[in-house]
Amino acid sequence: GCLTQLYENAFFRGGDVASMYTPNAQYCQMRCTFHPRCLLFSFLPASSINDMEKRFGCFLKDSVTGTLPKVHRTGAVSGHSLKQCGHQISACHRDIYKGVDMRGVNFNVSKVSSVEECQKRCTSNIRCQFFSYATQTFHKAEYRNNCLLKYSPGGTPTAIKVLSNVESGFSLKPCALSEIGCHMNIFQHLAFSDVDVARVLTPDAFVCRTICTYHPNCLFFTFYTNVWKIESQRNVCLLKTSESGTPSSSTPQENTISGYSLLTCKRTLPEPCHSKIYPGVDFGGEELNVTFVKGVNVCQETCTKMIRCQFFTYSLLPEDCKEEKCKCFLRLSMDGSPTRIAYGTQGSSGYSLRLCNTGDNSVCTTKTSTRIVGGTNSSWGEWPWQVSLQVKLTAQRHLCGGSLIGHQWVLTAAHCFDGLPLQDVWRIYSGILNLSDITKDTPFSQIKEIIIHQNYKVSEGNHDIALIKLQAPLNYTEFQKPICLPSKGDTSTIYTNCWVTGWGFSKEKGEIQNILQKVNIPLVTNEECQKRYQDYKITQRMVCAGYKEGGKDACKGDSGGPLVCKHNGMWRLVGITSWGEGCARREQPGVYTKVAEYMDWILEKTQSSDGKAQMQSPA
């Protein structure tokens, strides 16, 4: 299953399959997730080690048993790959690292006014993988405001150095935010020239294209079909690059197929997995396990559940079958692709779905109409769980926020439905940033069921929580995916990086905002919060957030939206925007429904009709 916990001051001994430099443990975890054999990782921050060569070291590890012995190492961080973690699987990494220079091949230098602008340039440059930016206060005047675009053979820095007044980060192309755009065309009977960066075996050009998309240096590819004239080159997928970023030449060639990486696509990237099953095809590789199962789909499920399994072959040979069950061969290789592909067999083959980010049909967990004041504009895909709850009576208007917590579930505030309990009048928009982008043709979800907490009373602040079941499940994308829920009664975690988002008023007597706003707000203890509210009881089912001096807060129209906190690289839904005394007033924190206190209720209500909980726990 999915394991998200991180181990502080621990290092996994042995099992190394690769090593690289990464700026933090989360990026190291992401590289582990996308490495075909990595199950575990250990990361050495700069503070944890004196050896300059090992600082920022990210060590990817495999283990036949799925675990390795942990040794104590002060400052080290270890953890698991996020394979099998559904919507948490993403190659997108937005963080900017201050005081860090990520080294690589510098291929472009320009002057820009901010690190965000530098990141944007990197994202809009086809070859840029990461960047460094020298700030206004950099010690050498001539380098100030320099934006260095970089690449490296492995897509990760060749070294990382601590350097004052330098900020570094990665391209946001994996976040589907590139302005370049992409070529979706597949060119039959055409071979591209240029430099081969890798060679793998694939059953078709589409798998080849997906592998190219997620390979750090692949810009385009050529695939040789199973009827290619040279037998040893059949099913070969050549991943390619060039100085210019496009093929310098192409040659008409029978039984070849060429195309481009889809990494530069805007708004949609292919899933990093291959779900198709190939009848009459055998995939060769190292044997992991053989099991008797009923049908090829069950074989694929078995492979997906066995975390080290990369691909499988389901044999229909009479000698491989007993009654209705046949042999399911679970296999793996060094690069995640078959070592041999044979056609015209009595088998069916396919890949593990461990990297599919749709996951199962579940919601993600781990072990006064209020109100964003003092916020800033959000960017695409920054808060992919945020939804807009709109009411269509004569006109249509945004009324509340909400959080996507599963394919078919939204969590919001009960008070959003005060006086409007009819499900037919509501429209739920997900995967949007600007309300002005909504037209009559914009797809929306309708409500199948509104479940208001049984103890909620209209115009009271208690038990301000409601679940919405959507009529149809939503697919997950970089812009539309769920937020993880906290564990039940989560009281031990100290959250220091919390954000509130919404389209609500930007001042107490204001109006709904067009662009989704975000504001970083510190949590306030319930004891402190209680002292600020002379007349209202702040219960253990509430959480407060706000600045002593005010100025930043949620406001009217943000109700029901998320208060999310990032902990160990993972966002969790800590609160639901509920109520407050005005907006952003001095010494009046916002009050949020504490989600951890309602986990039993959420789990109970999201049970599927067959009695299975529609929740998965990555913990």
């Epitope: 509210y533 002379q534 007349d535 009881k537 702040i538 010494e587």
Partner: antibody
Framework: EVQLVESGGALVKPGGSLRLSCAAS????????IFWVRQMPRKGLEWIGR????????KYDPKIQGKATITADTSTDTAYMELSSLTSEDTAVYYC?????????WGQGTLVTVSS | DIQMTQSPSAMSASVGDRVTITCEAS??????IAWYQQKPGKAPKLLIY???TLQSGVPSRFSGSGSGTDFTFTISSLQPEDIATYYC????????FGQGTKVEIK
């Protein structure tokens, strides 16, 4: 309309006990805190204790600890305060109040006189 | 525990006068001070909380200020209906009242 009505005040002998009631209307007591405060004759105000009726969590002034026991019945929206080992020093008007961070609304008070 | 020293204990003023009452805390109370008005035979009424925030429905002639350990309560223009005893209350650490200030008309 929010209302708090105290009752149970009486003349009691030193060493005796008494149970005061605080009946709430216009709100549910489990949605607030109930406080007890007393005022000795021609003297200032003194906080006694507080209850969260939802979970029966109580807090008392350390100086009065043991003298008073506060309870609540959410089914009748009534809070109680049991006073024991009474002395003449406990002669006072006893108020119940509701609120969050402090006492926002008060009852009219009930007089307890301790005398032989 | 925190002690609250309120002064004066009593004062006389004319209608329209500015009236000032002070309260000194034995420790820093982080601005968690409230002011109550009590008329004879009645229960106290909350006027101000968190040093300077006016409880809803309270006239704006009442105000509060201060920080740390020193706090002031002011009636900008005394009205006949303001004749009462005023108490400060710290609620930073449990609850402690001041001794009260009786305000009378000259």
């Amino acid at each position: 309309e929010v209302q708090l009505v105290e009752s149970g005040g009486a003349l009691v002998k030193p060493g005796g006990s008494l149970r005061l009631s605080c009946a709430a209307s216009g709100f549910n007591i489990k949605d607030t805190y109930i406080f007890w405060v007393r005022q000795m004759p021609r003297k200032g105000l003194e906080w006694i204790g507080r209850i969260d009726p939802e979970n029966d969590n109580t807090k008392y002034d350390p100086k009065i600890q043991g003298k008073a026991t506060i309870t609540a019945d959410t089914s009748t929206d009534t809070a109680y305060m049991e006073l024991s080992s009474l002395t003449s020093e406990d002669t006072a008007v006893y108020y119940c109040a509701k609120g969050g961070g402090l006492f926002a609304y008060w009852g009219q008070g009930t007089l307890v006189t301790v005398s032989s | 525990d925190i002690q609250m020293t309120q002064s004066p204990s009593a004062m006389s003023a004319s209608v329209g006068d500015r009236v000032t009452i002070t309260c000194e805390a034995s420790h820093d109370i982080n601005n968690y001070i409230a002011w109550y008005q009590q008329k004879p035979g009645k229960a106290p009424k909350l006027l101000i909380y968190y040093t300077s925030t006016l409880q809803s429905g309270v006239p704006s002639r009442f105000s509060g200020s201060g920080s740390g350990t020193d706090f002031t309560f002011t009636i900008s223009s005394l009205q006949p209906e303001d004749i009462a005893t005023y108490y400060c209350l710290q609620y930073d650490n449990l609850f402690t009242f001041g001794q009260g200030t009786k305000v009378e008309i000259k």
